[in-house]
C-alpha cells in the first residue's frame, strides 16, 4: 500500500496508469493543506480493497477535481 | 423525466463521416457514464465503449478501437459517437444508454469522497438506424 | 461469435417456467456480476435484471437471476404472451477490458 506512516503526505508512490473507473470503488480526495503541498487522490480499487494513489496532474483525474469542485461550490452554505 | 435521446442517423454513403448525439436530461450528467450498443440487423447487441463525463475519459471495445470515437459536452449533457469513414459493416440500430454512477458525498468536509457503481445500463435511448449504403 | 454463450432459443406456454442460461468465463462472469435485458420487437433494451439476482422497479417479480462461477440464470416464472422477445445477458470481461453480451436468446411464447 503506497501510503506513508509521516504526518506529511499520506502517498509515497503514485501510479501513473490510466484511470478506468470500472475498475474503482471510490476515491477519495485530500486537498493541499500545510502537512502536505498537493491534493492527493487515493483510490480503493474494486477488486480486493487495495490502495493506489493517483496522478493528480493526469488529465482525468484533473477533470475530476474540476467537477468535484463545481459540487462543492454548488452545496456550499 | 430521465431520458436519453439519440439522433444524427441516417442513410450515408460509406466513406463518408458521421456523428450521433444521445442528449440527455432528467438527471445530473456527469454523474453517470453513457454508453454506446448497436444491434446489427440478424445480430445480437455490441458494446462499443463509453465515456464518463466526469473523468473526461472514453474506453473502446477493442473492436472499435480507432474506428469510432466517443466524446461528450457536459454543458449540454449530450454524448457523442462519431466516425470519420463509415463502412458498410457498421449498418445498425445505435443505442445509447445510462451505466456507471459517481456519487460525490463528503463534500463540505476535507476530504471528500467520489462513490463508484456500476449497476447494468438501466436508461437506453429510442435508438437510432444508420444504413452505410451507396 | 459471441463472449458468453447463450441457447439461440427458448419456449414455452403461457403459465410456464423458462430458464435462459450463459455461460462464460474467469475474467467475466467469473469475476464480474451478471446483467440481463429483455428487447421487445421494435422497441429499446431494457434492464432486467442487474448484479446477478437485483430487479430494477417496475421489473416484475416473475423475472429472477443467479449466478453460479463462471455462469448465470434468467428464470422467467409465469410466463406471459409479452414476455416474448430477445433476452440478452451481459458482464464486464476483465481480460478484454469491456462488455460483453451473450448471442441473445429468443423467447417464444407458444
Known amino acids: 500500500v503506497p501510503l506513508s506512516r509521516t504526518v506529511r503526505c499520506t502517498c509515497i508512490s503514485i501510479s501513473n496508469q490510466p484511470v478506468n473507473p470500472r475498475s474503482l470503488e471510490k476515491l477519495e480526495i485530500i486537498p493541499a493543506s500545510q502537512f502536505c503541498p498537493r491534493v492527493e487522490i487515493i483510490a480503493t480499487m474494486k477488486k480486493k480493497g487495495e490502495k493506489r494513489c493517483l496522478n493528480p496532474e493526469s488529465k482525468a483525474i484533473k477533470n475530476l477535481l474540476k467537477a468535484v469542485s463545481k459540487e462543492r461550490s454548488k452545496r456550499s452554505p | 423525466q430521465v431520458q436519453l435521446v439519440e439522433s444524427g442517423g441516417g442513410v450515408v454513403q460509406p466513406g463518408r463521416s458521421l456523428r450521433l448525439s444521445c442528449a440527455a436530461s432528467g438527471f445530473t450528467f456527469s454523474s453517470f457514464s453513457i454508453t454506446w450498443i448497436r444491434d446489427p440487423p440478424g445480430k445480437g447487441l455490441e458494446w462499443i465503449g463509453e465515456?464518463?463525463?466526469?473523468?473526461?475519459?472514453?474506453f473502446y471495445a477493442q473492436k472499435f478501437q480507432g474506428q469510432v470515437t466517443i466524446s461528450a459536452d457536459k454543458s449540454i449533457s449530450t454524448a457523442y459517437l462519431q466516425w470519420s469513414s463509415l463502412k458498410a459493416s457498421d449498418t445498425a440500430m445505435y443505442y445509447c444508454?445510462?451505466?456507471?454512477?459517481?456519487?460525490?458525498?463528503?463534500?463540505?468536509?476535507?476530504?471528500?469522497?467520489?462513490?463508484?457503481?456500476?449497476?447494468?445500463?438501466?436508461?437506453w435511448g429510442q435508438g437510432t438506424l444508420v444504413t452505410v449504403s451507396s | 461469435q459471441s463472449v458468453l454463450t447463450q441457447p439461440p432459443s427458448a419456449s414455452g406456454t403461457p403459465g410456464q417456467r423458462v430458464t435462459i442460461s450463459c455461460s462464460g468465463s474467469s475474467s467475466n462472469i467469473g469475476s464480474n456480476t451478471v446483467n440481463w435485458y429483455q428487447e421487445l420487437p421494435g422497441a429499446a433494451p431494457q434492464l432486467l435484471i442487474y448484479?446477478?439476482?437485483q430487479r430494477p422497479s417496475g421489473i416484475p417479480d416473475r423475472f429472477s437471476g443467479s449466478k453460479s462461477g463462471t455462469s448465470g440464470s434468467l428464470v422467467i416464472s409465469g410466463l406471459q404472451s409479452e414476455d416474448e422477445a430477445d433476452y440478452y445477458c451481459?458482464?464486464?470481461?476483465?481480460?478484454?477490458?469491456?462488455?460483453?453480451f451473450g448471442g441473445g436468446t429468443k423467447l417464444t411464447v407458444l
Open positions: 448484479n446477478n439476482d
Open positions: 451481459a458482464s464486464w470481461d476483465d481480460s478484454l477490458n469491456g462488455r460483453v
Open positions: 465515456i464518463t463525463p466526469m473523468f473526461g475519459i472514453a
Open positions: 444508454a445510462r451505466d456507471g454512477r459517481f456519487d460525490v458525498s463528503d463534500l463540505l468536509t476535507d476530504k471528500p469522497k467520489v462513490t463508484i457503481n456500476y449497476n447494468g445500463m438501466d436508461v
